[in-house]
Structure formats: structure tokens, C-alpha cells
């Protein structure tokens, strides 16, 4: 929901967390603000305190339950409000009717590990974290490999258009240090976006055998 120079953006991690960012030009720094979640078909509601992340933006996480609980479904609609304290009362600064499964951002993949490494290739696996079973296999991944002397931004993106929690990296240089990252996105949801990148996994290819061409 955008209100003048105010922007209120939230994502559901598909299980028990809604993360929100609210930005507003000229907002008072000392004001206490919170996000309030009111589902249309649940008996519970939840709030979180907005904390500053930059000069004009605040963020918070609505914890809806245990991390792997399925607290919302495709039919839920959650009214999300930004409330800021004005004296003794709360003022509504932004509001949106939030459809959780139209606004998905999963947790970053975890448990990255090298399954097998050779001189020119490396097989890497990972796991998805706190992802709803609703997706079944309807997920896609992007991966990138950091080569020596390059930046992450320069790394070409490898796309996996299916739920495949491994990759075999080819054409690597022997005896070279690399880093690898992966992110995940459900196919569902009009405003769904990529998860954060995973923590980088460092690995080194094996040296070429002596006396052999590389």
C-alpha cells in the first residue's frame, strides 16, 4: 500500500512469519510504530514493533507461531496496518489487505554442502527451510558461483526451473577457491519474490594431477 511518500511492503515466508518494511519520507524518528496483523478468518492477531533500518525505513517480523507451523493458507486475507503513537492514541499510517500466498518470500536455503569435488567440477546440495508443503515441487532456484578476481554481481546466474536441491558445477579451474550461493522462489504468487541468497559455501577444486594436461 502506497500513501503519498509512504510505502508498506510485506512478505510471507509460507509458514509462520510475515516480514514488513515501512518507509516514509519525513517520518518522526522518535515515534513508536508497530505493524498489526488481523486475519479475516482466524481468532488470533499479532503485532511487532517497527525498528529503524535506515534514515526513513523501518522493519519488523510478525511471528505467527512455531517456525514450521502452517499458520496461514491460500484463502486467508490479513489486514496489515502500520500504527504510530500520537500522544495517547495510535494513528493508522498505512494499511493493506494482504494475501499471504500472493506475497511470498521464502527463507534462504540452508545446509549447503559439497557432495563431491574434482579438478573441474563440484557437486553441491542444499535444503529449503520453512517452506510450505503446499508448493509440492513448484519451486525454482537461482545459483551463482564467485570466481577469483570477480564480484558476486558479476557472477552469471544459473537457473534451475524445478525443485532440484543440488547442482553440478562444470568447467571449473583446478586448485582454485570458489564460493557458491543459491536462492529459491515459489512459482505461486503475483508479488512473490526471490528469497535472500544463502550463506556462501566456500570450496576448492582439486589440483590437476602432475604430468597431465589440464
Amino acid at each position: 500500500a502506497v500513501n503519498g511518500t509512504s510505502q508498506f511492503t510485506c512478505f510471507y515466508n509460507s509458514r509462520a512469519n510475515i516480514s514488513c518494511v515501512w518507509s516514509q519520507d519525513g517520518a518522526l524518528q522518535d515515534t513508536s510504530c508497530q505493524v498489526h496483523a488481523w486475519p479475516d478468518r482466524r481468532r488470533w492477531n499479532q503485532t511487532c514493533e517497527l525498528l529503524p533500518v535506515s534514515q526513513a525505513s523501518w522493519a519488523c517480523n510478525l511471528i505467527l507461531g512455531a517456525p514450521d507451523s502452517q499458520k496461514l493458507t491460500t484463502v486467508d486475507i490479513v489486514t496489515l496496518r502500520v500504527l504510530c503513537r500520537e500522544g495517547v492514541r495510535w494513528r493508522v499510517m498505512a494499511i493493506q489487505d494482504f494475501k499471504p500466498f500472493e506475497n511470498l518470500r521464502l527463507m534462504a536455503p540452508i545446509s549447503l554442502q559439497v557432495v563431491h569435488v574434482e579438478t573441474h567440477r563440484c557437486n553441491i546440495s542444499w535444503e529449503i527451510s520453512q517452506a510450505s508443503h503446499y508448493f509440492e515441487r513448484h519451486l525454482e532456484f537461482e545459483a551463482r558461483t564467485l570466481s577469483p578476481g570477480h564480484t558476486w554481481e558479476e557472477a552469471p546466474l544459473l537457473t534451475l526451473k524445478q525443485k532440484q536441491e543440488w547442482i553440478c558445477l562444470e568447467t571449473l579451474t583446478p586448485d582454485t577457491q570458489y564460493e557458491f550461493q543459491v536462492r529459491v522462489k515459489p512459482l505461486q504468487g503475483e508479488f512473490t519474490t526471490w528469497s535472500p541468497w544463502s550463506q556462501p559455501l566456500a570450496f576448492r577444486t582439486k589440483p590437476a594431477a602432475l604430468g597431465k594436461d589440464t
Epitope: A66, D68, Q70, K71, T73
Partner: nanobody
């Protein structure tokens, strides 16, 4: 359907402790997460603590470090150990269970009153 029955509420002085219990019956195999919510004078039902079938937990900010949630899957029971109770913890405490499909089940609630 899942039925939930809470017990353990009561009147306690500030600084004291209480242990709430909740027993699930019925279609217990469908239960994933179990949780405690509380509803105070503002009539809002908010999360106190939650625990998944495999033991992952989450707590409301106001109770972190004071309350501990635990679960015995074999007994279909969830507990809430409440220490260092404050008057602002006074509320009706509700047991909640959520299914793998996202359905919510609720107990009838148990009153906790903390006097100063």
C-alpha cells in the same frame, strides 16, 4: 476434529510461577504446531509461545526469558511454564493447535490472574 483442554490457571502473586497444561484429543495425527495465546483486557488474542512437532519454538517478546513452552508428543500434551509473573501477564490463556493443512483448533481458555 481436534479437542483441546487447558488446565493449571489460577491466582498467583507477582514474581510467582504457574504451569499450564493442554491435552489434545481427537484427530491428533493432524496436529503440527501447538501454541499458547492470551487475551487480556484489550480483547486481542496474541501469541505467547509456540512449539512445532519437532520441537522448534517461538516466543512473544514480552515473555522471552520468563516463559518456557514444552511438548510431549506421546501424551499429546503441551505445557507452558510461567516464571517471574507480572500483573500484566493477567489474561485468559488459550491453547491452540494447527494442522498440517492450516486449520486452527482452540481450547476454552484458562484464567491466569497475577496480583501485585
Amino acid at each position: 476434529q481436534v479437542q483441546l483442554q487447558e488446565s493449571g490457571g489460577g491466582l498467583v502473586q507477582a514474581g510467582g510461577s504457574l504451569r499450564l497444561s493442554c491435552v489434545a484429543s481427537g484427530s491428533v495425527s493432524s496436529i503440527n504446531g501447538m501454541a499458547w495465546y492470551r487475551q487480556g483486557a484489550d480483547n486481542q488474542r496474541v501469541l505467547v509461545a509456540a512449539i512445532s512437532r519437532v520441537g522448534n519454538t517461538a516466543y512473544g517478546d514480552s515473555v522471552k526469558g520468563r516463559f518456557t513452552i514444552s511438548r510431549q508428543n506421546a501424551r499429546n500434551t503441551v505445557y507452558l511454564q510461567m516464571n517471574s509473573l507480572k500483573p500484566e501477564d493477567t489474561a485468559v490463556y488459550y491453547c491452540n493447535a494447527d494442522s498440517w493443512g492450516g486449520d486452527d483448533y482452540w481450547g476454552q481458555g484458562t484464567q491466569v490472574t497475577v496480583s501485585s
